[in-house]
């Protein structure tokens, strides 16, 4: 289980980049009834390499317990891996009607902020 | 504990904005030895109001357990509360030398990404 495959997977999962998964249309929260699955692309991964001096000090302060974050809102000590471009997603609803929702899926990612 | 004061505090903590705290220089991770405290400003708070259709669907998928995030890297379903401007921080080290570190403290925040 901890062989070269899992190491490669962990390395591949690490950096900020575009991911893709098959998801149920009904779980997209669009209010459309559908039994179909559709390919949804999103961004995830670390942006540690893009940290500023501010981020490094913020991380240090948080790590040392020297900063007391506001309740329920921990500050982010690296840029966020976020979509920089989007595309529409199309799917068929239970009435066999094709629906298209603009800007629902990511097509490019970046370390923003 | 659940009176109007705590509700106001929670509301104030919620949105993305500039925060300020007094912190020990030694906890900034700069490599300078100092016994001083300095004012460190950072950004935190929610950016839920700035969510895109993509973010809403991503949050829905995550909430429904319909998305399987890469190991150790959960995607972010709202823009990040991050600094948009910075300022230098100055302090005195143990040798009574003034040190200035550029762009260490935030001066403005925004919902980025």
């Amino acid at each position: 289980a901890g062989g070269p495959g899992s190491r490669a997977r962990a390395a591949g999962a690490r950096g900020c980049r575009l991911r893709s998964q098959l998801v149920p249309v009904r779980a997209l929260g669009l209010g459309h009834r559908s039994d179909e699955l559709v390919r949804f692309r999103f961004c995830s991964g670390s942006c540690r390499r893009a940290r500023s001096p501010h981020d490094l000090s913020l991380a240090s302060l948080l790590g040392a317990g020297a900063l007391r974050p506001p309740p329920g809102s921990r500050p982010v000590s690296q840029p966020c891996c976020r979509p920089t471009r989007y595309e529409a997603v199309s799917f068929m609803d239970v009435n066999s009607t094709w629906r298209t929702v603009d800007r629902l899926s990511a097509t490019a990612c970046g370390c923003l902020g | 504990a659940g009176g109007p004061g705590s509700r106001a505090r929670a509301a104030g903590a919620r949105g993305c904005r500039l925060r300020s705290q007094l912190v020990p220089v030694r906890a900034l991770g700069l490599g300078h030895r100092s016994d001083e405290l300095v004012r460190f400003r950072f950004c935190s708070g929610s950016c839920r109001r700035a969510r895109s259709p993509h973010d809403l669907s991503l949050a829905s998928l995550l909430g429904a357990g319909a998305l399987r995030p890469p190991p150790g890297s959960r995607p972010v379903s709202q823009p990040c509360c991050r600094p948009t401007r910075y300022e230098a921080v100055s302090f005195m080290d143990v040798n009574s030398t003034w040190r200035t570190v550029d762009r260490l403290s935030a001066t403005a925040c925004g919902c980025l990404g």
């Epitope: 495959g5 591949g12 298209t100 899926s105 | 399987r68």
Partner: antibody
Framework: QVQLVESGGGVVQPGRSLRLSCEAS????????LHWVRQAPGKGLEWVAF????????YYPKSVKGRFSISRDNSKNTLYLQMNSLRAEDTAVYHC????????????????WGQGTLVTVSS | DIQMTQSPSSLSASVGDRVTITCRAS??????LNWYQQKPGKAPKLLIY???GLQSGVPSRFSGRGSGTDFTLAISSLQPEDFATYYC?????????FGPGTKVDIK
């Protein structure tokens, strides 16, 4: 190297059941979404079932929905297809296939296929 | 369901020829289009993934392009081992449909 080996095919009467198995080796089984694809004699390819890496999502086309059930045992590196209420039109070679990419980068391209197991539904 | 059509359904060509096969989807499938090669009695083999990605071990004479609903597979210089049936497949929307296939045989 990656290997997918199907078993469980054979001749069965209409209305009866059959369970296909696919033993996998050469890759981290639980990292990949898997599919069954069939091919009727002399015909094209037809996709029949999908299961996500952790078994949380499965999907079937209308032609088999309610009759076929896909499952997996990640501890045994084995994929299954339970086929009930079999019909003559289910006669085909059934291939077990794996996706090319890790579950979180899945694009639906099928990079390894088993040689297939023949299912014949006939009275 | 998304219908996949391929043209031509069959073609005859000579070694060294450039061959192009077209695949069309009835609805947009973004770039989730894959191409497979199948020889008689064998399992299909992945050639091209997500429109233009060349699968590891596949010769560079194979290439793919397209977007939305219209896609092509090109073989720049046909080799004896390329005589086979080629299938496109959309993996964007369930059910994941295949095209009917294009049989490439020797002229």
């Amino acid at each position: 190297q990656v290997q997918l080996v199907e078993s469980g095919g054979g001749v069965v009467q209409p209305g009866r059941s059959l369970r296909l198995s696919c033993e996998a080796s050469g890759f981290t089984f639980s990292d990949y979404d898997l599919h069954w694809v069939r091919q009727a004699p002399g015909k094209g390819l037809e996709w029949v079932a999908f299961i996500s890496n952790d078994g949380s999502n499965e999907y079937y086309p209308k032609s088999v929905k309610g009759r076929f059930s896909i499952s997996r045992d990640n501890s045994k590196n084995t994929l299954y297809l339970q086929m009930n209420s079999l019909r003559a039109e289910d006669t085909a070679v059934y291939h077990c296939t794996k996706e090319r990419d890790y579950y979180y980068d899945s694009s639906g391209s099928l990079d390894y296929w088993g040689q297939g197991t023949l299912v014949t539904v006939s009275s | 369901d998304i219908q996949m059509t391929q043209s031509p359904s069959s073609l005859s060509a000579s070694v060294g020829d450039r061959v192009t096969i077209t695949c069309r989807a009835s609805q947009t499938i973004n770039n989730y289009l894959n191409w497979y090669q199948q020889k008689p009695g064998k399992a299909p083999k992945l050639l091209i993934y997500t429109t233009s990605g060349l699968q590891s071990g596949v010769p560079s004479r194979f290439s793919g392009r397209g977007s939305g609903t219209d896609f092509t597979l090109a073989i720049s210089s046909l080799q004896p081992e390329d005589f086979a049936t080629y299938y496109c497949q959309q993996s964007y929307h369930s059910p994941f449909t295949f095209g009917p296939g294009t049989k490439v045989d020797i002229k």
